[in-house]
Amino acid sequence: AVLIPQSSVCPNAEANNFLQNVKVNLKVINSLSSKASSRRPSDYLNRSTSPWTLSRNEDPDRYPSVIWEAQCRHQRCVNAEGKLDHHMNSVLIQQEILVLKREPEKCPFTFRVEKMLVGVGCTCVSSIVRHAS
């Protein structure tokens, strides 16, 4: 990720290409207080009845270049005995995020905004039961 220095001259918002060409300062300010982030759970992935694993999705031509993605460990959920419950399904919870993708044919500091669907965790849902009519 490359930090683009902010210009002292503000662009003209009236300009036709204003929304197509915006300078972004990529300096990340951690807005989460330490209390909030210390409560952020890292063990739910194992304690959940629909446990998941995390993989480090790397794309050097994307900002951020590292995104941690969840995958459900099982198709079914885990019951209190630690066995798979065939009446319950593990499903991935996905979130749509915006990322910046480098435009390779242009200079390394040119990016375009793209949507990306990221798995953030798994939850347990009851299986759909289809009754014979």
């Epitope: 490359v2 890292s42 992935l45 995390l54 993989s55 050097p60």
Partner: antibody, heavy 119, light 107 residues
Framework: EVQLVQSGAEVKKPGASVKVSCKAS????????FHWVRQAPGQGLEWIGV????????AYNQNFRDRATLTADKSTSTAYMELSSLRSEDTAVYYC????????????WGQGTLVTVSS | DIQMTQSPSSLSASVGDRVTITCKAS??????VGWFQQKPGKSPKLLIY???NRYTGVPSRFSGSGSGTDFTFTISSLQPEDFATYFC?????????FGQGTKLEIK
């Protein structure tokens, strides 16, 4: 002030396991990745793997996937690297280092832990 | 894995000299290269990130350049405290890899 303080030197027998700790202070532990790197005597640096204390995710260098285990304890802001089935070639200084995921570089390093594997 | 080939492996120079170390990646790593200084018994210290950006507090005599596969690290005027080993490193894709190091010695 950001500090990464590692546990002391260890001497182990071949086949044994070692667990090295790295205690972080001066910043929010769950915000950044922890990477582990080793340096054999007179050699270059070799990347072992990464853990993100915020979500518990891990990734490993293929060369260490079967023997290394990375964990983190949020209550004590400590990251751990366990290496099993030790052999003499594992004699090295092991470093923990903080990786700024968004900015994309290693900024702070622990002081290193020397692990000697000898029969 | 991406190989980082660093040269020279050792270098003798005098205080005030200009010194250049090169690093060649086995494939393009864009600008995702860092340079580290390491003194005996100490941990590596970040000097340059993203090929050419000086890290906070690093003196201006240290500089870096390059992109793609070829990278250069320069010390414009050697100071007594600069005699150490220098490593390049790529964080373009894991497993992250390092050059073998250049030992800078007093002539």
């Amino acid at each position: 002030e950001v500090q990464l303080v590692q546990s002391g030197a260890e001497v182990k027998k071949p086949g044994a396991s070692v667990k090295v700790s790295c205690k972080a202070s001066g910043y929010t532990f769950t915000d950044y990745e922890f990477h582990w790197v080793r340096q054999a005597p007179g050699q270059g640096l070799e990347w072992i793997g990464v853990i993100h204390p915020g979500n518990g995710g891990t990734a490993y260098n293929q060369n260490f996937r079967d023997r290394a285990t990375l964990t983190a304890d949020k209550s004590t802001s400590t990251a751990y690297m366990e290496l099993s089935s030790l052999r003499s070639e594992d004699t090295a200084v092991y470093y923990c280092t903080r990786f700024l995921t968004y900015e994309g570089y290693f900024d702070y390093w622990g002081q290193g832990t020397l692990v000697t594997v000898s029969s | 894995d991406i190989q980082m080939t660093q040269s020279p492996s050792s270098l003798s120079a005098s205080v005030g000299d200009r010194v250049t170390i090169t690093c060649k990646a086995s494939q393009s790593v864009s600008i995702d290269v860092g340079w580290f200084q390491q003194k005996p018994g100490k941990s590596p210290k970040l000097l340059i990130y993203h090929a050419s950006n000086r890290y906070t507090g690093v003196p201006s005599r240290f500089s870096g350049s390059g992109s793609g596969t070829d990278f250069t690290f320069t010390i414009s005027s050697l100071q007594p405290e600069d005699f150490a080993t220098y490593f390049c490193q790529q964080d373009y894709s894991s497993p992250y890899t390092f050059g073998q190091g250049t030992k800078l010695e007093i002539k």
